[in-house]
Amino acid sequence: EEELQVIQPDKSVLVAAGETATLRCTATSLIPVGPIQWFRGAGPGRELIYNQKEGHFPRVTTVSDLTKRNNMDFSIRIGNITPADAGTYYCVKFRKGSPDDVEFKSGAGTELSVRAKPSAPVVSGPAARATPQHTVSFTCESHGFSPRDITLKWFKNGNELSDFQTNVDPVGESVSYSIHSTAKVVLTREDVHSQVICEVAHVTLQGDPLRGTANLSETIRVPPTLEVTQQPVRAENQVNVTCQVRKFYPQRLQLTWLENGNVSRTETASTVTENKDGTYNWMSWLLVNVSAHRDDVKLTCQVEHDGQPAVSKSHDLKVSAHPKEQGSNTAAENTGSNERNIY
C-alpha cells in the first residue's frame, strides 16, 4: 500500500480580520493509526494550534467529524481571526506510540494572510496658532492595517496637496502596520473655514477610503486691522471717537482706550459681527469731554488679540483751535493719527 501523504491543498488563505479561516488538510490513507495536530510555524518553537487527541482549543473547530470511521479530512476552522494569527500552518500526522505518539508526516503548510482595516485617520495640527502666510504642519496617523500596501493623500478644501512626507512602519514583515504622514500647509487670510483632509486607501476598504479632517479654524489666527475715526459732535463739548476692529479671528479680544497714555476704559469683544470668510468685526466707541482738556488729546485704541502683544492705533484730538467745528467732517479727518505696533 502506498505510504500516507498529508496534503494541504491551499498554499495560501486570505482572511479578513474578524472572519473565520478554513485550513484544509487531507490524508491519503488511514494507516498508520494516530492523531493529527496543527501547528503554526515549524521547528522547535512551533505553536500548537490544535490537537485531535487532547487539549482545549476554543477558537478551533474541525470541518468534519474526526470520530467518523474512514474520515481523512483533518481541515480546521479558526474563528475571529486577527493580524496576530498570520503565519504558516502545518497539518502533522502522528503515529500512535508508547509512551508518546511519534511525528510521522507533515503537510507542506498553508500560509494564512490576514487583511485588517486601517483605523480611522487622526489628523492633528500645530500646538499654537499661526498667522496667514506662515507654513504649518499637520500630521495624520492610522494603525493596525494589513497588508502593508496603503495610499495616503492630503487635501485642502478638495485640492490635493503635494508637500508631505509619509512613512509606513515597521519596514520589515509584521502582523500589522501603521502609517504616519506630515503635510505642510501655507495659511491664507481666508482659511478660517478651510479644512485639511487626510485620505487613506487600502485593499480592505473596497474603494471607499477613510478620511480624517482638521479645521484650520483651530490653527489660524488672523490679526485685526484697526481704524480710529472721530464722529460728529454729540453735544457742545463731547466728541465721539470709534475704533473699528476688523477681520480678526478667533474672537478672543480685549480693547483698551487710552487718553494721553492713561487708561480710560477696557472692554472685551462681545457682540461681534461675522464676515463671510469667518473672521469677525467689532466696534468700540469713546465719548470724550473736550472741555475737560486744555491741550490736544491723544486717543489710543489698544487691542490685545488672542493673547498676542497689543497693537494700537492713535488719533490726535485738537481741542484748542475750533472747538465748535470739531464735529464737522472736514475737521474729523484723522489729523496727526499714527499707528504704533508694540511687540
Epitope: P9, K11, V13, L14, T26, S64, A108
Partner: antibody, heavy 121, light 112 residues
Framework: QVQLVQSGAEVKKPGASVKVSCKAS????????IFWMRQAPGQGLEWMGW????????DYAQKFQGRVTMTMDTSISTAYMELSRLRSDDTAVYYC??????????????WGQGTLVTVSS | DIVMTQSPLSLPVTPGEPASISCRSS???????????LDWYLQKPGQSPQLLIY???NRASGVPDRFSGSGSGTDFTLKISRVEAEDVGVYCC?????????FGQGTKVEIK
C-alpha cells in the same frame, strides 16, 4: 471516463431558492473535493465554495455565507448547491468542478457543463 | 483578493498563425517552493471548461503541445504556436496560490 453532469436550467423569482445538482461518475466520488463556481453575464468566474464528499465538510466564500448550502449524497455520487434569497444579480451560469491535488498543487481537472439560473420577477 | 487581469478580451485569429494571451496578477504567484500558481482553462462553445496548463507552464493530460504557458511572478502568457479551428472559445487564467481562487475575465478567441 470522468464526468460531472449538472441539472437543467432554472428560472426563479427574487427571494426564492434554487438547488443545483452535480452528478459524478467515472471516479471515486469521496476521493475529491467538489468546488462550485459561477459566471454572471459578461463577468469572470467567481469561486463560491467547496464540499469534501469524504467528510461532508464545507467552506463558503465570505460573499455567499448565510445564503449558500453545499450538501451531497454519496449513495448516488451527487453534490448539491443551494442558493437562497435570490436576487437579480444572482443570474449566472453555475458550475461544479472536481479539484485534483498533487503534493504540490491543485487544479480543477473536470467541470460540469454549467446550469443557467435566471432570477427575474 | 488577488485580482487577475487578462488582455486582450477578444482575439481574432487566423488558422495556422500563432496567438498569445496575457494574464497579470495583482500580486506575485511565485511560491517559495519555486512554482508559479497559475492555471489556464479553455471553454469551447457549448462545452465545459477544461484545464490546459497548471503551475504556469505544465500542460494538462491530453493537451496538444501547440499550447504553452510561460511567465513568472505577476506576468504570464499563454501561447498557441499554430491556431487550429478547434481552438476557438474563451480562455481564462486562474490563480491557484490563494483561497479565494480568482479568475481573469476571459479572452474570447475566434477565427477571423
Amino acid at each position: 471516463q470522468v464526468q460531472l453532469v449538472q441539472s437543467g436550467a432554472e428560472v426563479k423569482k427574487p427571494g426564492a431558492s434554487v438547488k443545483v445538482s452535480c452528478k459524478a461518475s467515472g471516479y471515486t466520488f469521496t476521493g475529491y473535493y467538489i468546488f462550485w463556481m459561477r459566471q454572471a453575464p459578461g463577468q469572470g468566474l467567481e469561486w463560491m465554495g467547496w464540499i469534501n464528499p469524504n467528510s461532508g465538510g464545507t467552506d463558503y466564500a465570505q460573499k455567499f455565507q448565510g445564503r449558500v448550502t453545499m450538501t451531497m449524497d454519496t449513495s448516488i455520487s451527487t453534490a448539491y448547491m443551494e442558493l437562497s434569497r435570490l436576487r437579480s444579480d444572482d443570474t449566472a451560469v453555475y458550475y461544479c468542478a472536481r479539484e485534483d491535488c498533487t503534493s504540490i498543487s491543485c487544479s480543477f481537472d473536470y467541470w460540469g457543463q454549467g446550469t443557467l439560473v435566471t432570477v427575474s420577477s | 483578493d488577488i485580482v487577475m487581469t487578462q488582455s486582450p478580451l477578444s482575439l481574432p485569429v487566423t488558422p495556422g498563425e500563432p496567438a498569445s494571451i496575457s494574464c497579470r496578477s495583482s500580486q506575485s504567484l511565485l511560491h517559495s517552493n519555486g512554482y508559479n500558481y497559475l492555471d489556464w482553462y479553455l471553454q469551447k462553445p457549448g462545452q465545459s471548461p477544461q484545464l490546459l496548463i497548471y503551475l504556469g507552464s505544465n500542460r494538462a493530460s491530453g493537451v496538444p503541445d501547440r499550447f504553452s504557458g510561460s511567465g513568472s511572478g505577476t506576468d504570464f502568457t499563454l501561447k498557441i504556436s499554430r491556431v487550429e479551428a478547434e481552438d476557438v472559445g474563451v480562455y481564462c487564467c486562474m490563480q491557484a496560490l490563494q483561497t479565494p481562487r480568482t479568475f481573469g475575465q476571459g479572452t474570447k478567441v475566434e477565427i477571423k
